[in-house]
């Protein structure tokens, strides 16, 4: 049997026998275009494609629509994989989304959605989520039904205000909604009573900016 040389996600890489976490090259569905992603081969059985990571504030997340579309940052540290790739990938097969969160007091929590996909750019990469479980709140901190994606230069929220400009970062803002994992990074002891921080309301409550976040996806049938 001929060895697979291109992979659409980290689950395929894991199943090929490459089971060490790290940076791998993925290929866009039905294309030869490539993208580098961090693959988490340790959490919950491995095979996770990391689509977002925050840990230290080293990367500016107040970026343009184009940058969020194409991705930015470093897969070894803080980064956004790219809306276009994630939209194409999650449009081909059913994916689950796992969001891992860390606070400044040493606690960790997660939210798991059993079906996740992004609509195409023509629909502003609207997020679709179902089936929430996990420890980071019984109510989804990403508003349901899903919102369109907004950035500082593309205002698609459900608010007469401009959520992305006020709250910082690109996100699926509602009006403006209970979360923003792409907000401004605040260090410890400066992370409370912040409206533009890294927020997951139904875990940490009002105005709390988190220490670290990871968003990762994997095929539902993995």
């Amino acid at each position: 049997k001929e060895e697979q040389t291109t992979f659409r996600d980290c689950a395929e890489i894991f199943k090929s026998g490459l089971t060490t976490s790290g940076i791998y090259t993925l290929t866009f569905p039905n294309s030869t275009e490539e993208i580098k992603a961090y693959c988490d081969m340790d959490v919950g059985g491995g095979g996770w494609t990391v689509i977002q990571h925050r840990e230290d504030g080293s990367v500016d997340f107040q970026r343009t629509w184009k940058e969020y579309k194409e991705g930015f940052g470093s897969p070894l540290g803080e980064y956004w994989l790219g809306n276009e790739f994630v939209s194409q990938l999650t449009g081909q097969h059913r994916y689950v989304l796992k969001i891992q969160l860390k606070d400044w007091e040493g606690n960790e929590a997660h939210s798991l959605y059993d079906h996740f996909y992004l609509a195409g750019e023509e629909s502003n990469y609207r997020i679709h989520l179902t089936g929430l479980t996990g420890t980071a709140g019984k109510i989804s901190s990403i508003s349901q039904p899903g919102s369109d994606f907004s950035t500082k230069d593309s205002d698609n929220d459900k608010c007469i205000c401009k959520c992305s400009q006020m709250l910082s970062g690109g996100w699926w803002f509602d009006a403006c909604g209970p979360s923003n994992l792409n907000g401004q990074y605040y260090p410890q002891k400066q992370n409370t009573n912040k409206f533009n921080g890294i927020k997951w309301y139904y875990w940490k409550g009002s105005g709390y900016s988190l220490k670290a976040t990871t968003m990762m996806i994997r095929p539902a049938d993995f």
């Epitope: 007469i160 509602d174 009573n193 409206f195 533009n196």
Partner: nanobody, 123 residues
Framework: EVQLVESGGGLVQVGDSLRLSCAAS?????????VGWFRQAPGKEREFAAG???????AYADSVRGRFTISRDNAKNTVYLQMNSLKTEDTAVYYC????????????????WGQGTLVTVSS
Amino acid sequence: EVQLVESGGGLVQVGDSLRLSCAASGRTFSTYLMVGWFRQAPGKEREFAAGIWSSGDTAYADSVRGRFTISRDNAKNTVYLQMNSLKTEDTAVYYCAGSYDGNYYIPGFYKDWGQGTLVTVSS
């Protein structure tokens, strides 16, 4: 400790005007995403009336749009609600609240609240 204190309520006639004030101590209003005015009529749920975002943008409930105006004075750390052409259905306790999160029209997302000031509009 954060304290929001409302003032300016009272008894007025239909068609009259009233200006409510909300003063903050222990925090500047600029730290909030939104400062909102909510109202609660007897036997009814608390509802959003008007709000002002950190950016200065404003929002109004359909029932008050065109009659009420929200503004703020950063130097005085005070938010105002100018209420014109008052109607009997505007009778309620009016609350000032500050929010860091969530959808602006949902009371549950607001963290800090005042004690309220009563507005009664009689015919």
